[in-house]
């Protein structure tokens, strides 16, 4: 299977909400032996391998933000996380999974990674990740709402979090 990032760059004004999204697709075994572990974390550019470093998002680790379920089941993190840290990760039945960040600040700027681990019994795993950049801007140059730049072309799209 593969992971696709719908957008490679999100440019948002301070105070806005944004939902970063990944989609995993391809031949997915929906059998009882397979479990999917999905998570989000921050990383940094300039590494040999993108997303190899795992840093917390707003002090929440990859384990705090992970989703864990079989097949394409829907799942989401606890609402406590969303309330306390302005974060919530979620997954739907179609392979989409996302993290919503509320009330963005300049400190939220950086590289974000989504990761899917396909886990089979006994403990064998296959990892695939996607990366995207979030730029939070302030002042007169900031957009009025979030602008997302698609991964495959230069056309931009205005987006707002649900």
């Amino acid at each position: 299977f593969k992971v696709a990032t719908l957008y490679s760059l999100y440019v948002c004004p301070e105070g806005q909400n944004v939902t970063l999204t990944c989609r995993f697709f391809g031949p997915v075994d929906k059998g009882h032996d397979v479990t999917f572990y999905k998570t989000w974390y921050r990383s940094s550019r300039g590494e040999v391998q993108t997303c190899s470093e795992r840093r917390p998002i707003r002090n929440l680790t990859f384990q705090d933000l992970h989703l864990h379920h079989g097949g394409h089941q829907a799942a989401n993190t606890s609402h406590d996380l969303a309330q306390r840290h302005g974060l919530e990760s979620a997954s739907d039945h179609h392979g989409n999974f996302s993290i919503t960040m509320r009330n963005l600040t300049l400190l939220d700027s950086g590289l974000y990674c989504c990761l899917v681990v396909e886990i089979r019994h006994h403990h064998s795993e296959h990892r695939v990740h996607g990366a995207m950049e979030l730029q939070v801007q302030t002042g007169k140059d900031a957009p009025s709402s979030c602008v997302a730049y698609p991964s495959s072309s230069q056309e931009s799209e205005n987006i707002t979090a649900a």
Epitope: H32, S52, V117, H121, E125
Partner: antibody, heavy 120, light 111 residues
Framework: DVQLQESGPDLVKPSQSLSLTCTVT?????????WHWIRQFPGNKLEWMGD???????NYNPSLKSRISITRDTSKNQFFLQLNSVTTEDTATYYC?????????????WGAGTTVTVSS | DIVLTQSPASLAVSLGQRATISCKAS??????????MNWYQQKPGQPPKLLIY???NLESGIPARFSGSGSGRDFTLNIHPVEEEDAATYYC?????????FGGGTKLEIK
């Protein structure tokens, strides 16, 4: 909160079978990863015995493979250990545990343990 | 099987000082940049309790005075500053290869 509780006989005679039950509350054994049996010998050495996956498939420590069986009853949310042809060397505290994943596999929830003595 | 050798077998540390426990694996426990090494604390009459997973990740609810480090074959658990309640036996455990194995344990006494 996930809780695990072991139950079974305290005393088993040599050459007989040891049978233990792990009752899981607060989490479905068909919804998680793997459910394990681990034992701790009187000298405190810990040994992983085997596990049963959410799908029902099993994996055993090769050192026990000819004697061990792990099964489950999903309707009761229980899984079981059967160890055949026991000897005094099988005297130990037996724990059931759940594993979890986070770029390593680890035991995040354990039962309190039950001590089994093998003696005639 | 992967053999985990812990050292020392026991140590006594003064309150507030640093306790350092080593775990050496007979072969690497790394995969894809991660170390499949975990640390547990066990007190008499209780089951082991997870402290650190993946060599350095602190389990939720565990005090920050516990930290883990290392990769490949060599791993360390540090406790600083040591508190009275830390008196226990500590075990490392690998999950890179079946059968999963544990170290022989290190008993920590507080002076």
């Amino acid at each position: 909160d996930v809780q695990l509780q072991e139950s079974g006989p305290d005393l088993v005679k040599p050459s007989q079978s040891l049978s233990l039950t792990c009752t899981v509350t607060g989490y479905s054994i068909t919804g998680g990863y793997n459910w394990h049996w681990i034992r701790q010998f009187p000298g405190n050495k810990l040994e992983w015995m085997g596990d049963i996956h959410k799908s029902g498939s099993t994996n055993y420590n090769p050192s026990l493979k000819s004697r061990i069986s792990i099964t489950r009853d999903t309707s009761k949310n229980q899984f079981f250990l059967q160890l055949n042809s026991v000897t005094t060397e099988d005297t130990a505290t037996y724990y059931c545990a759940r594993d979890y994943y986070g770029f390593s596999w680890y035991f995040d929830v354990w039962g309190a343990g039950t001590t089994v003595t093998v003696s005639s | 099987d992967i053999v985990l050798t812990q050292s020392p077998a026991s140590l006594a540390v003064s309150l507030g000082q640093r306790a350092t426990i080593s775990c050496k694996a007979s072969q690497s426990v790394d995969y894809d940049g991660d170390s499949y090494m975990n640390w547990y604390q066990q007190k008499p009459g209780q089951p082991p309790k997870l402290l650190i997973y993946g060599a350095s990740n602190l389990e939720s609810g565990i005090p920050a005075r516990f930290s883990g480090s290392g990769s490949g074959r060599d791993f360390t658990l540090n406790i600083h500053p040591v508190e009275e309640e830390d008196a226990a036996t500590y075990y490392c455990q690998q999950s890179i290869e079946d059968p999963w194995t544990f170290g022989g344990g290190t008993k920590l006494e507080i002076k």
